[in-house]
Amino acid sequence: CDLPQTHSLGNRRALILLAQMRRISPFSCLKDRHDFEFPQEEFDDKQFQKAQAISVLHEMIQQTFNLFSTKDSSAALDETLLDEFYIELDQQLNDLESCVMQEVGVIESPLMYEDSILAVRKYFQRITLYLTEKKYSSCAWEVVRAEIMRSFSLSINLQKRLKSKE
């Protein structure tokens, strides 16, 4: 499956929107840094099938969408930027869903890569728990925004590696 050229442009736009969502100086939030235990092994160059990588990427973007579409995120972040962000993520999800269906078929894909998908879900659960514990403070959102920018960048790198292997 070939992801369209617009897909990588959308990735870049999503990263730019995340950067623009900054509300306060991150220098004041150092004490709130937290280890979310990003599931790096799911994004490393191990010899997994392309379909598995696409499933993991899809889950990553779906969970990002879920995280940023809560009422708490709407209250904390710029709504115009959030709306644009949702559009970009939605397009990413559509592209990846088309790919998943082409690669493995719709029935088997969710079950085949359950462990990888579960690792991504647990990662986002840790992020949500952190935000809850920090009472969705400005600094907590700043830390999470930085974390999502990093994980999003790693997702983009995985997509680039998939493309180069074609």
């Epitope: 950067a19 900054r22 991150p26 150092l30 004490k31 840094r33 979310f36 974390e147 990093r150 960048s153």
Partner: antibody, heavy 121, light 107 residues
Framework: EVQLVQSGAEVKKPGESLKISCKGS????????IGWVRQMPGKGLEWMGI????????AYSPSFQGQVTISADKSISTAYLQWSSLKASDTAMYYC??????????????WGQGTLVTVSS | DIQMTQSPSSLSASVGDRVTITCRAS??????LNWYQQKPGKAPKLLIY???SLQSGVPSRFSGSGSGTDFTLTISSLQPEDFATYYC?????????FGQGTKVEIK
Amino acid sequence: EVQLVQSGAEVKKPGESLKISCKGSGYSFTSYWIGWVRQMPGKGLEWMGIIDPSDSDTAYSPSFQGQVTISADKSISTAYLQWSSLKASDTAMYYCARHPGLNWAPDFDYWGQGTLVTVSS
Amino acid sequence: DIQMTQSPSSLSASVGDRVTITCRASQSINRFLNWYQQKPGKAPKLLIYAASSLQSGVPSRFSGSGSGTDFTLTISSLQPEDFATYYCQQAIDLPFTFGQGTKVEIK
């Protein structure tokens, strides 16, 4: 391979201006902050300030606020430290180092080789 | 600003010795503490971050512990290449501050 390469040694006279550089390579330059550290001859490490190259937001140690200016040009992956009027007491080795910002990763894991600044009449 | 105090300021030890350096913060810094090694004419090198996490490529004879205000760097068996100056640095708040350094010399 991650590298921070600093500009060469400088010999200046008191009152002169100076801008030294730190060029990053082998990583996404805007994903890390760049900090500057001073080490006077035979002395310890002193943190001067930091910049987020993604938007050039800066923070300074009170001891260096107003004495130096930190800047960055993300288009060429380079951070700068500058003085408008050097003093003899600015004679030191200056290091740049990268910092992961708010991400959970090792702080100041890569350092430049240092730039020796000598200010003498 | 948070003050960082290291002790001792210097120590003499032999190859194979167990060496302990302590660092005290003027207020709680949780576990936001880093340790660096510096050799003459060289840039500092990160050894330990977040109080006890060993930086990639650093020998396992180096270890860090502590939280709050009191921290320790331990070299379990001193090697010839370990003779250097060691600095702690708090990373919880700006301005970041370093300890004054501990010079480890050959006995």
